[in-house]
Interface confidence: low
């Protein structure tokens, strides 16, 4: 099937980084500057993504792959492929419609992005608060007072939560 297709369609021989140029009798021409083709057999090359403004270039465009952007310092990526950049806040804050705001009492944010989350309720697991929470840090739960014996201590910090609306890059 592949061989038949090649005989019928000369464009299928054009490798990535080139395009099948109808204006030149279907010759494989290299992609022009600032464009790319990531697969073979393409009749056009795609325009490279430009990382402008608050975006900065993480990976340059090549003839076979698009540029990749991330965000300038003070901003972080949102969406698949870093489609948007959003302002960072300080730890202990969250971004609202009115800008960065401190976490309310009883909540924390240990990152520069995302929302403030409630402190862990140690008593739900029958544990006691070993270290109090702050705006930047969750509480640390320890064994219940009854379990504490001299020299024994088991402190398990809570697992970090993933960010809302943030797709892994």
């Amino acid at each position: 099937f592949e061989r038949t297709r090649s005989l019928q369609d000369p464009c299928s021989n054009c490798p990535a980084g080139t395009f099948c140029d109808n204006n030149r009798n279907q010759i494989c021409s290299p992609c022009p500057p600032n464009s790319f083709s990531s697969a073979g057999g393409q009749r056009t090359c795609d325009i490279c993504r430009q990382c402008k403004g608050v975006f900065r270039t993480r990976k340059e465009c090549s003839s076979t792959s698009n540029a990749e952007c991330d965000c300038t310092p003070g901003f972080h990526c949102l969406g698949a492929g870093c489609s948007m950049c959003e302002q960072d806040c300080k730890q202990g804050q969250e971004l609202t419609k009115k800008g960065c705001k401190d976490c309310c009492f009883g909540t924390f944010n240990d990152q520069k992005r995302g929302i403030c989350r409630p402190w862990t309720n140690c008593s739900l697991d029958g544990k006691s608060v070993l270290v109090n929470g702050t705006k930047e840090r969750d509480v640390v739960c320890g064994p219940s007072p009854a379990d504490l014996s001299p020299g024994a201590s088991s402190v398990t910090p809570p697992a970090p939560a993933r960010e809302p609306g943030h797709s892994p890059q």
Partner: antibody, heavy 123, light 107 residues
Framework: EVQLVESGGGLVQPGGSLRLSCAAS??????????VSWIRQAPGKGLEWIGI????????NYAQKFQGRVTISRDNSKNTLYLQLNSLRAEDTAVYYC??????????????WGQGTLVTVSS | DIQLTQSPSSLSASVGDRVTITCRAS??????VAWYQQKPGKAPKLLIY???NLETGVPSRFSGSGSGTDFTLTISSLQPEDFATYYC?????????FGQGTKVEIK
């Protein structure tokens, strides 16, 4: 006052393409922290998100379902966005909305919507 | 994609009634949920964002609550203009998704 006005809907043949416009007023498409999404609603059905553009930089993201046959673009000088959808089938019959998207704190919510434009795919 | 399931699909109520609509997410979405109202032939209108924040200009009889996977929209005293379809939407994970809608009809 923020306003979004869609246009370009109508009857389209199966296999054809549509190009819808969304003219924005009352805010600039180059404002940081604002993006615009296209969302559709088939007759009597729920809302379905198609994709988003950050007009400030032209970056787009599309729902997996539409990947490969959708393009969202913008012309900031006209404060207008566009939705191009190719290889149309009967299931693409819907009212198409553009909606402003205020993203902050990692959340995407649609605070202003256009009135919608109806696209009917039929032979 | 994260699925949102609303219940009930429709309900009949009278003016002055307290109405509660629930939205359940297929996985934890923290508080990244919004509620919209849609009237026939009109575009949806944002009522609540971040699960419990009232959008500017929305009457205080609307309220939202919940976190994790279970969310509620409450209309404390139903008014004639509240008869409409209501949708929840999550923005915790990509892509944003909507519930199937709850139609509030006049009894």
């Amino acid at each position: 006052e923020v306003q979004l006005v869609e246009s370009g809907g109508g009857l389209v043949q199966p296999g054809g393409s549509l190009r819808l416009s969304c003219a924005a007023s009352g805010f600039s498409l180059s404002t940081s922290g604002v993006a615009v999404s296209w969302i559709r609603q088939a007759p009597g059905k729920g809302l379905e998100w198609i994709g988003i553009i950050n007009p400030n930089f032209g970056d787009t993201n599309y729902a997996q379902k539409f990947q490969g046959r959708v393009t969202i673009s913008r012309d900031n000088s006209k404060n207008t966005l566009y939705l191009q959808l190719n290889s149309l089938r009967a299931e693409d019959t819907a009212v198409y909305y553009c909606a402003r998207d205020e993203y902050y704190g990692g959340s995407y919510y649609f605070d202003y919507w256009g009135q919608g434009t109806l696209v009917t795919v039929s032979s | 994609d994260i699925q949102l399931t609303q219940s009930p699909s429709s309900l009949s109520a009278s003016v002055g009634d307290r109405v509660t609509i629930t939205c359940r997410a297929s996985q934890d979405v923290r508080t990244a949920v919004a509620w919209y109202q849609q009237k026939p032939g009109k575009a949806p209108k944002l009522l609540i964002y971040d699960a419990s924040n009232l959008e500017t200009g929305v009457p205080s009889r609307f309220s939202g609550s919940g976190s994790g996977t279970d969310f509620t929209l409450t209309i404390s005293s139903l008014q004639p203009e509240d008869f409409a379809t209501y949708y929840c939407q999550q923005s915790y994970d990509w892509p944003p998704t909507f519930g199937q809608g709850t139609k509030v009809e006049i009894k």
